[in-house]
Interface confidence: medium
């Protein structure tokens, strides 16, 4: 396998280029946010149009677990993605033009770590790279942040309370609301990714119902007010 | 809001020598590939010029090549143009535009004018 | 180099459908970028990646790519779409991108 190292492997009249990748030494991102992982690269063979693929790993180089893979034709612009760990990873680059740069959607915490991009020549110049060193990938905490609050109708007339939260760890979420002794409940919320939903099932009383989301970082708070029409008696 | 703003340009003669800098603000710019694009007046669009992320892989137009060198400084979110040999065809609107997907986002422009 | 081909002119009706075609060789095994440009503002990209609609265009602009055509499709027309359009790939084998020499839409009445 390739070592990393820069190795000429065509000779040419001309010096030819040798194999080289770039990629910085560190890329910072907020939980929920997205990161591009650049990568360019230099190659010896001049002109190449034959089947490339383009990986990236993580975790150590040459044997890390893949997240992405895509392939492009002989002649091709178009590099077909064989592999998207969870959906979240695109390239960002373009192949052809010495670019894999990889955007990775929704960070996590668990997304921090190093990531390896490689390129594999599998036509009449078979050949391969990949970065040795890699790109370090730092996913900060995020304090929470009401993304939405609202007021939907419920069964039977009622009315029923929605509130969603992101942040990194996920935030606990709870509601308050004018219920005698305005006592505060913590609910379970339905988790995806960074995101959080809470309901409150039925609203029995007109007033403000605050919905307050709390992670080690911090804490938000939205309010939603209810007012039904009352007609004369 | 992703902003790219051109400066430098100006009248110059036949042979002479310029440098475009563009600014860019509201996005990572050490993380995206750059290019500058001309528009000769009364004209169609053409590439002059790419460079990566980092600045390791430049390419040119062959009508531009040996003559003009494209460069960025990430540390000043700044992408440059350095004209020189330059020709009255060179006369345009250099634009700079962001590489993802096409030019997804450009500047509006700055005139560079050749004559005598 | 690979040459892109448009036609320099397109008129429609509004609320009609415009087309704009865009041919080269081999376009089917590369990516087609278009954009519009109105008179003395810099060119907006309105089709990506032969069919992608960046954020903020509207839908009635799409895109395809097949056979050595490409094409920009304008459903619905409307007065502000009058401007000139642009297609643009990029050519593996040079390094470069290359762009169309533009059609000029215009939207009758």
């Known amino acids: 396998d390739a070592s990393g190292d820069l190795l000429n492997t065509e000779a040419h009249s001309a010096p030819a280029q040798r194999w080289s990748m770039q990629v910085p030494a560190e890329v910072n991102a907020e939980a929920g946010d997205a990161a591009v992982l650049p990568c360019t690269f230099t190659h010896p063979h001049r002109h190449y149009d034959g089947p490339l693929t383009a990986i990236w790993r993580s975790g150590e180089p040459y044997a890390g677990p893949q997240v992405f893979r895509c392939t492009a034709a002989p002649g091709s612009e178009l590099c077909q993605t064989a592999l998207s760990l969870h959906g979240r990873f695109r390239l960002l680059g373009n192949p052809r033009r010495n670019d894999l740069s990889l955007r990775v959607e929704r960070l996590a915490l668990a997304d921090s770590g190093r990531y390896f991009c490689r390129v594999e020549f599998t036509g009449d110049a078979h050949d391969r790279y990949e970065s040795r060193h890699g790109v370090r990938l730092r996913v900060t905490a995020a304090a929470p942040r009401i993304v939405n609050i609202s007021v939907l109708p419920g069964p039977a007339h009622a009315f029923r309370a929605l509130c969603t939260a992101e942040g990194e760890p996920p935030p606990a979420l709870a509601w308050s609301g004018p219920a005698p002794g305005n006592s505060s409940a913590a609910l379970q919320g339905q988790g995806h990714g960074y995101q959080v939903t809470a309901e409150l099932p039925a609203l029995t009383r007109d007033g403000r119902y605050t919905c307050t989301a709390a992670n080690s970082l911090g804490r938000a708070e939205a309010s939603v007010y209810l007012f039904r029409f009352h007609g004369a008696p | 809001q992703v902003q790219l703003v051109e400066s430098g340009g100006g009248l110059v003669q036949p042979g002479g020598s310029l440098r475009l800098s563009c600014a860019a603000s509201?996005?990572?710019?050490?993380?995206?590939?750059m290019h500058w694009v001309r528009q000769a007046p009364g004209k169609g669009l053409e590439w002059v010029s790419y460079?990566?992320?980092?600045?390791?892989?430049?390419y040119y137009a062959d009508s531009v090549k040996g003559r003009f060198t494209i460069s960025r400084d990430n540390s000043k979110n700044t992408l440059y143009l350095q004209m020189n040999s330059l020709r009255a065809e060179d006369t345009a609107v250099y634009y700079c535009?962001?590489?993802?997907?096409?030019?997804?986002?450009w500047g509006q422009g700055t005139l560079v004018t050749v004559s005598s | 180099d690979i040459e892109l081909t448009q036609p320099p002119s397109v008129s429609v009706a509004p609320g009609q459908t415009a087309r704009i075609s865009c041919s080269g060789d081999n376009l089917p095994n590369r990516y087609v970028h278009w954009y519009q440009q109105k008179p003395g503002q810099a060119p907006v990209l309105v089709i990506y990646d032969d069919n992608n609609r960046p954020s903020g265009i509207p839908e009635r602009f799409s895109g395809s790519n097949s056979g050595n055509t490409a094409t920009l499709t304008i459903s619905g027309t409307q007065a502000e779409d009058e401007a000139d359009y642009y297609c643009q790939t990029y050519d593996m084998f040079s390094m470069s991108d290359v762009f169309g020499g533009g059609t000029k839409l215009t939207v009758l009445g």
């Open positions: 535009a962001r590489g993802w997907g096409g030019f997804d986002y």
């Open positions: 460079i990566s992320y980092s600045g390791s892989n430049t």
């Open positions: 509201g996005f990572t710019f050490s993380s995206y590939a």
